[in-house]
């Protein structure tokens, strides 16, 4: 069965900094990735940032720079501009539509005992949905 | 079939604004990102901006921050482009373009003339 | 910003003929997470609001005939028309696809003899 994994990670220099990890582990090929916050795509969440393989990525603030880290995975690098922190008690959502397997998404947040500059471990997956 | 019908040509005085439309039918909306695009006459493509329609946070093309303004409306499926300001320079067809650049609206050509 | 630069600006070739157009990128549109080049092509034709025509850099949009060809990595990329035929009489755009702000080609305007 395909499985979604979500890593969240806050910068050890900048507080206000994360970044979003994710990638799909199965057998299909990626056709567009979707991240959103505050719940999933489509069920109250806030789209942050498109990528498709071959069309490029596009995000939107408070996302900085989504990319591609691998065929299967990507990351999304957050800046919190307000004084104080949200991003760490936020959920991240991220949908991997793929072929010929449907759509699977998980989310994850920043652990709350998560030293700066730590990855967190795999998050559980909360939400695994195929649509 | 996909379609985005934009609003009609305006002429418009030096100095106004003008609030452009784009009518989205055929998709679901709030799944796909608007882009906003100028293309002068006989000239090339300018990108002008992109917004989505479940984030207040559009991204600008430095160039047209503070001449440009992206919102949309879910309830009618209709993204705007309001642009103030205006001079000869922003005379040109504007179009909207949903996704990737995949599918164009079928442009607003505005005049900018006293 | 990434500056693309088309060439030759205009060209004339007649119907059946094999015609080729460069895109030259200021900065590399590769990204070396998935090894693609997020570079497109589009087609105007008079009139017309431009069409998707080719995408990371040689896959074509669904309904493109096959005679338009994208290849090329990095800075340097190139559009063929196999055999061109009447209906191409358009000008031809490559976009940066890589990184904001999009940015475009100034065009080659293709005509036929």
């Known amino acids: 069965t395909p499985e979604v994994w979500v890593q969240v990670q806050m910068e050890a220099t900048e507080l206000s900094s994360f970044t979003v990890h994710c990638g799909f582990l199965g057998p299909g090929s990626i056709s567009l990735v979707t991240v959103s916050w505050g719940g999933p795509d489509g069920a109250g969440g806030t789209k942050l940032a498109v990528l498709h393989p071959e069309l490029g990525t596009r995000q939107w603030a408070p996302a900085r720079q989504a990319r591609w880290e691998t065929q299967s995975s990507i990351s999304l690098a957050l800046e919190d501009s307000g004084a104080s922190s949200p991003f760490a008690n936020t959920t991240f959502c991220c949908k991997f539509a793929s072929f010929p397997e449907g759509s699977w998404e998980s989310c994850g947040s920043l652990p709350p005992s998560s030293d700066p500059g730590l990855s967190a471990p795999p998050t559980p997956v909360p939400i695994l949905r195929a649509d | 079939e996909v379609q985005l019908q934009q609003s009609g040509p305006e002429l418009v005085k030096p100095g106004a604004s003008v609030k452009i439309s784009c009518k989205a039918s055929g998709y679901t909306f709030t799944d796909y990102f608007m882009n906003w695009v100028k293309q002068s006459h006989g000239k090339s493509l300018e990108w002008i901006g992109d917004?989505?329609?479940?984030?207040?946070?559009?991204n600008y093309n430095q160039k047209f921050k503070g001449k440009a303004t992206l919102t949309v409306d879910k309830s009618s499926n209709t993204a705007y482009m309001e642009l103030r300001s205006l001079t000869s320079e922003d005379s040109a067809v504007y179009y909207c373009?949903?996704?990737?650049?995949?599918?164009w609206g079928t442009g607003t050509t505005v005049t900018v003339s006293s | 910003d990434i500056v693309m630069t088309q060439s030759p600006s205009s060209l004339s070739v007649s119907a059946g003929e094999k015609v080729t157009m460069s895109c030259k990128s200021s900065q590399s549109l590769l990204n070396s997470g998935n090894q693609k080049n997020f570079l497109a092509w589009y087609q105007q034709k008079p009139g017309q609001p431009p069409k998707l025509l080719i995408y990371g850099t040689s896959t074509r949009e669904s309904g493109v005939p096959d005679r338009f060809t994208g290849s090329g990595s990095g800075t340097d990329f190139t559009l063929t028309i196999s055999s061109v035929q009447a209906e191409d009489l358009a000008v031809y755009y490559c976009?940066?696809?890589?990184?904001?702000?999009?940015?475009f080609g100034g065009g080659t305007k293709l005509e036929i003899k």
């Open positions: 917004i989505i329609p479940n984030n207040d946070s559009p």
């Open positions: 976009q940066n696809d890589h990184s904001y702000p999009w940015t």
């Open positions: 373009a949903s996704g990737y650049f995949d599918v």
